[in-house]
């Protein structure tokens, strides 16, 4: 055998963030020489599941008919060819929403904001949580985590944006979570539409301020600015 077998590709359909009770299919794609596919879940000592390849043998399907807490977690897959086992795939993080009641998302001072001004998105939960996530629809990297320091639980998190530009406009939702499993999220908040008015020729903000522009604003995570004085949360990326 000349070198290790190439690693397979692992993905989930319809996506990797699944509501409680919904179905999800995990796919592992290897090569045409594959004889067996294996799915491993982090912290599970035995192979989580194994399947024969589907014709023409280059991939396998692992079905989850109804999403529950037990399925949330980090997965890798492998395939076995006549010369042995492949390298592991890159991990797939399967996240379940609906584990907790939905938080409330609001904009301060208003969801109508003039370009160049500041706005803070406030995510509030009824019960204390230690992680809050803000997502923007149709963003390539939508998850922004604010996690509390030292496990202190909070009822809210602030996501300040300054200066606001046209790229900040759009539909946002937030989730809350407990630190013991960031694969389990609350129901999503009701959507909040952030409307940015003003000049269409907004200057591009500095990457150290609100939006990283290396690959264009829609291809990068939305970063909060400043400190988070009232929440006790720190910015944290998964």
């Amino acid at each position: 055998q000349a070198g290790p077998l190439p690693k397979p590709t692992l993905w989930a359909e319809p996506g990797s963030v699944i509501s409680w009770g919904n179905s999800v299919t995990i796919w592992c794609q290897g090569t045409l020489e594959a004889r067996e596919y294996r799915l491993d879940k982090e912290e599970s000592p035995a192979p989580w599941d194994r399947q024969n390849p589907l014709e023409p043998k280059n991939k396998a399907r692992f079905s989850i008919p109804s999403m529950t807490e037990d399925y949330a977690g980090r997965y890798r897959c492998y395939y076995r060819s006549p010369v042995g086992w492949s390298q592991p795939s890159d991990p797939l993080e399967l996240v379940m929403t609906g584990a907790y009641s939905k938080p409330t998302l609001s904009a301060l001072p208003s969801p109508l904001v003039t370009s160049g001004k500041s706005v803070t998105l406030l995510c509030q939960s009824r019960s204390p949580m230690d992680t809050f996530l803000l997502i923007k629809e149709r963003a390539a990297h939508p998850l922004l985590h604010l996690r509390s320091e030292h496990g202190a639980q909070q009822h809210q998190a602030e996501f300040p944006m300054s200066p606001v530009t046209s790229v900040h406009g759009g539909t946002y939702r937030c989730f809350s979570s407990h630190g013991f499993s960031h694969y389990l999220l609350s129901h999503p908040s009701d959507p909040l539409e952030l409307i940015v008015s003003g000049s269409l020729e907004d200057p591009r903000p500095s990457p150290t301020r609100s939006v990283s522009t290396a690959a264009g604003p829609e291809d990068q995570p939305l970063m909060p600015t400043g400190s988070v004085p009232h929440s006790g949360l720190r910015r944290h990326w998964e």
Epitope: S44, A46, W48, R50, N52, D70, R80, P82, W85
Partner: antibody, heavy 124, light 107 residues
Framework: QVQLVQSGAEVKKPGASVKVSCKAS????????MHWVRQAPGQGLEWIGE????????NYNEKFKTRATLTVDTSTSTAYMELSSLRSEDTAVYYC?????????????????WGQGTLVTVSS | DIVMTQSPSSLSASVGDRVTITCRAS??????LNWYQQKPGGAVKLLIY???RLHSGVPSRFSGSGSGTDYTFTISSLQPEDIATYFC?????????FGGGTKVEIK
């Protein structure tokens, strides 16, 4: 030491169901898949299916997919095999068997320990 | 499903004899071949896995070899306690399938 102790012999009428149990000890039950295999009188071994006790995932032989149901009770480290719509051809010794990784190199998996077997007789 | 053809179906040999059993798969099984011993009382034991690897606690007189579709199991010096039926089993693809068995008796 690893032990798989199965329930006692059963006599069933055609059309009935049977549920065979397999109590595991001497290892961590959820770390190994459990297989079920049967052997009709004077015949070879026939694989029924497998179950992962840690998550309940199952794979079945197509031949038994509609009639066999594999389950586990992790609180008692017990695996179960239920076979429905019994017919005389199902008269056999049913075995549970532990499946897991052998050796140091990843990828060598085999059934390494077997239960003593449970005779199921289907007769009118 | 992969069909495993085992031969002979039975054999009789003297204590100390070399005994050989063969197993042929209907397609290449890439060495994923195990051998089991079933004693007259019904107890089943794994002897060899992945064609040639001896399971822990199994005497070294048992050995295995082969590749592709053709595999061999050997008892180098038959002992009285080896009276049993021996099965091959492929683990290359689901479902696992077994050979028909070889019953070994002492002359």
């Amino acid at each position: 030491q690893v032990q798989l102790v199965q329930s006692g012999a059963e006599v069933k009428k055609p059309g009935a169901s049977v549920k065979v149990s397999c109590k595991a000890s001497g290892y961590t039950f959820t770390n190994y898949w459990m297989h079920w295999v049967r052997q009709a009188p004077g015949q070879g071994l026939e694989w029924i299916g497998e179950i992962n006790p840690s998550n309940g995932r199952t794979n079945y032989n197509e031949k038994f997919k509609t009639r066999a149901t594999l389950t586990v009770d992790t609180s008692t480290s017990t695996a179960y095999m239920e076979l429905s719509s019994l017919r005389s051809e199902d008269t056999a010794v049913y075995y549970c068997a532990r499946w897991g990784q052998l050796g140091l190199r990843e990828g060598y998996y085999a059934v390494d320990y077997w239960g003593q077997g449970t005779l199921v007789t289907v007769s009118s | 499903d992969i069909v495993m053809t085992q031969s002979p179906s039975s054999l009789s040999a003297s204590v100390g004899d070399r005994v050989t059993i063969t197993c042929r798969a209907s397609q290449d099984i890439s060495n994923y071949l195990n051998w089991y011993q079933q004693k007259p009382g019904g107890a089943v034991k794994l002897l060899i896995y992945y064609t040639s690897r001896l399971h822990s606690g199994v005497p070294s007189r048992f050995s295995g070899s082969g590749s592709g579709t053709d595999y061999t199991f050997t008892i180098s010096s038959l002992q009285p306690e080896d009276i049993a039926t021996y099965f091959c089993q492929q683990g290359n693809t689901l479902p696992p399938t077994f050979g028909g068995g070889t019953k070994v008796e002492i002359k």
